[in-house]
Amino acid sequence: KFSKQSWGLENEALIVRCPRQGKSSYIVDWYYSQTNKSIPTQERNRVFASGQLLKFLPAEVADSGIYTCIVRSPTFNRTGYANVTIYKKQPDCNVPDYLMYSTVSGSEKNSKIYCPTIDLYNWTAPLEWFKNCQALQGSRYKAHKSFLVIDNVMTDDAGDYTCKFIHNENGANYSVTATRSFTVKDEQGFSLFPVIRAPAHNETKEVEIGENTNLTCSACFGKGAQFLATVQWQLNGNKITDFSEPRIQQEEGQNQSFSNGLACVNTVLRIADVKEEDLLLRYDCLALNLHGLRRHTIRLSRK
C-alpha cells in the first residue's frame, strides 16, 4: 500500500507528510490505524493533524505506529499510510542505522549536505551542524539556508552529519535533529564560463495579448556536479522578486544533465494574461557561476 516510513526521537518535534499527495485545497483526515481513532486538529493537542501534515509536538515513544491519512477531493478519496517510529534518545554519540537518512555523496566541487525533512518545519536560520557529534567550527563550514557547504572537501570529511534546528509552533519551540552520512567521491568534472542555450541573444518572441506565455532560460556550466550555477530572469535589470507583478512568476531552476554529461539548468518565466505593457519590458536571461556572468536579452512582440 501507499506508505512511508518516518522516524524521530522522543522529546523532539516530528512532522510527517501524508504520503498520498493532493492539492492544498483537498481535505485530509488522519486516523491512528490500530484504533481507527481520529487525530484531532486542535493545536492544543500534543499530536494533531494540520492538513497534509501530522505533528508530534513533541514526540513520545508511545506515538509509534501506523497512521492513516485520507485525502478527499470532491469526487475521490485516496488513502496513505505513515509508519511512524519514535526512538529513545541515544546515551552515547553513536547514531544507529535506523535513525539515518539517505547517504549523500560530495566532491571537491560539490559538497552540499541538505538537512533532511527540514522543509516540513517552521524553522529559522542558522542551522547547527555536527559531524560525528562534534559541533562544526571553522571557515571551511558554511551553514547556508537548509544545507551545509564544505570548502575544499577531502576524503576525511566523510562521516555522519547531524543538523539541529528549532521548530516554532504558536510561539513554542521544539528541537529537531536529523542525521545522514556523507561520502566523498573523486569526480572528474569541470566548470566553464556559462553557455546560454536559450534564448538566443536579442531574440524576439511573438505573443498574443491576453494569452499566457513561457520564456525558458537554459544554460550549461560544464561537466559533472557544479558548486555554483544559477540561472535566473531579470525584468528591465531588476530581480523578478523586486518586480511586483503577480502575473509574472519565475520557476525554481530545474537541473538537467545531458547524455554528454553537460550540467545545465533551466528556469522558466511564466507570464499570465500578456498585456501591452509587457511588450515594453526587457527580459534578461542571466547565467552565473564562479567563472562569471552571461546575459541574453529577449523581447516580446505582438503576434
Partner: antibody, heavy 123, light 107 residues
C-alpha cells in the same frame, strides 16, 4: 456536468499533419491534467500524451515523441494535439480525458472521457 | 515501461455468474492501478481506482483487490449490461500503460 468534445479527426496521407481539439466544459479546466489516449481499430487503449495543469510539464509516449505536441489554451478551455509526420500506425480513435487529481509530478486515473475522434492515415 | 498483462483474453459466462479478471504488472505499481469498462462504440468508463476503491456511481457488484504486481477485478453477479471489455491501467509512473483487455462475453 463535465463534458469533453473532440474534433479535428479525418483522413490524412502518411507524412501529413492534423490538429485535434478537445473542448472542455463543466469544470475548472486550467487546474486539471489533461490526457490524450488512442485506440487503433479493434485494439486496446494506448496512452499518447499528458499535459499537467497550471501550465505544467508535458509527457509523451515513445511512439509519438518528436512528432506530436500536446498543448492547452486555458482561456478557451481547450486541449490540443498537433500531429505531424503521421504514419499508418497512428490510425486510431483519439480520446481526450481528464485526470481528476493532478498533483505535481504524479498521475492518476481518467475519470471523464470524450466520445473520441477518428484519425485515418492512409494513401 | 511497466507492462500490464491481463488474463484471460476472453471470459465466457452467463448472467448471474461471478467474473474474476486478472491483471499482472511487470514491476510493482503499489496500489496505483485502475480498472475501466468499455462497450462497443463508447469511451471507457472508470470503475475502480487505487486498486480497490469504487468510482462514484459504480455498483457494489464490482470490486477490486491486490497490491504490488497482482490485481483482480471481480464482478460478483454479472448483469446483462456488464458484458464488455475491461482494461487495467497503471499510473505510478509515465508512460501510463494499459493492459491488452479482457472481453467478458455471454456464454
Amino acid at each position: 456536468e463535465v463534458q469533453l468534445l473532440e474534433s479535428g479527426g479525418g483522413l490524412v496521407q502518411p507524412g501529413g499533419s492534423l490538429r485535434l481539439s478537445c473542448a472542455a466544459s463543466g469544470f475548472t479546466f486550467s487546474i486539471y491534467d489533461m490526457i490524450w489516449v488512442r485506440q487503433a481499430p479493434g485494439k486496446g487503449l494506448e496512452w499518447v500524451s499528458t499535459i499537467k495543469g497550471e501550465g505544467g510539464g508535458t509527457y509523451y509516449a515513445d511512439s509519438v515523441k518528436g512528432r506530436f505536441t500536446i498543448s492547452r489554451d486555458n482561456s478557451k478551455n481547450t486541449l490540443y494535439l498537433q500531429m505531424n509526420s503521421l504514419r499508418a500506425e497512428d490510425t486510431a480513435v483519439y480520446y481526450c480525458a481528464r485526470d481528476p487529481w493532478s498533483t505535481e509530478g504524479s498521475f492518476f486515473v481518467l475519470d471523464y472521457w470524450g466520445q473520441g475522434t477518428l484519425v485515418t492515415v492512409s494513401s | 515501461e511497466i507492462v500490464l498483462t491481463q488474463s484471460p483474453a476472453t471470459l465466457s459466462l452467463s448472467p448471474g455468474e461471478r467474473a474474476t479478471l486478472s491483471c499482472r504488472a511487470s514491476q510493482s505499481v503499489d496500489d496505483d492501478l485502475a480498472w475501466y469498462q468499455q462497450k462497443p462504440g463508447q469511451a471507457p468508463r472508470l470503475l475502480i481506482y487505487d486498486a480497490s476503491n469504487r468510482a462514484t456511481g459504480i455498483p457494489a457488484r464490482f470490486s477490486g483487490s491486490g497490491s504490488g504486481t497482482d490485481f483482480t477485478l471481480t464482478i460478483s453477479s454479472l448483469e446483462p449490461e456488464d458484458f464488455a471489455v475491461y482494461y487495467c491501467q497503471q499510473y505510478i509512473t509515465a508512460p501510463l500503460t494499459f493492459g491488452q483487455g479482457t472481453k467478458v462475453e455471454i456464454k
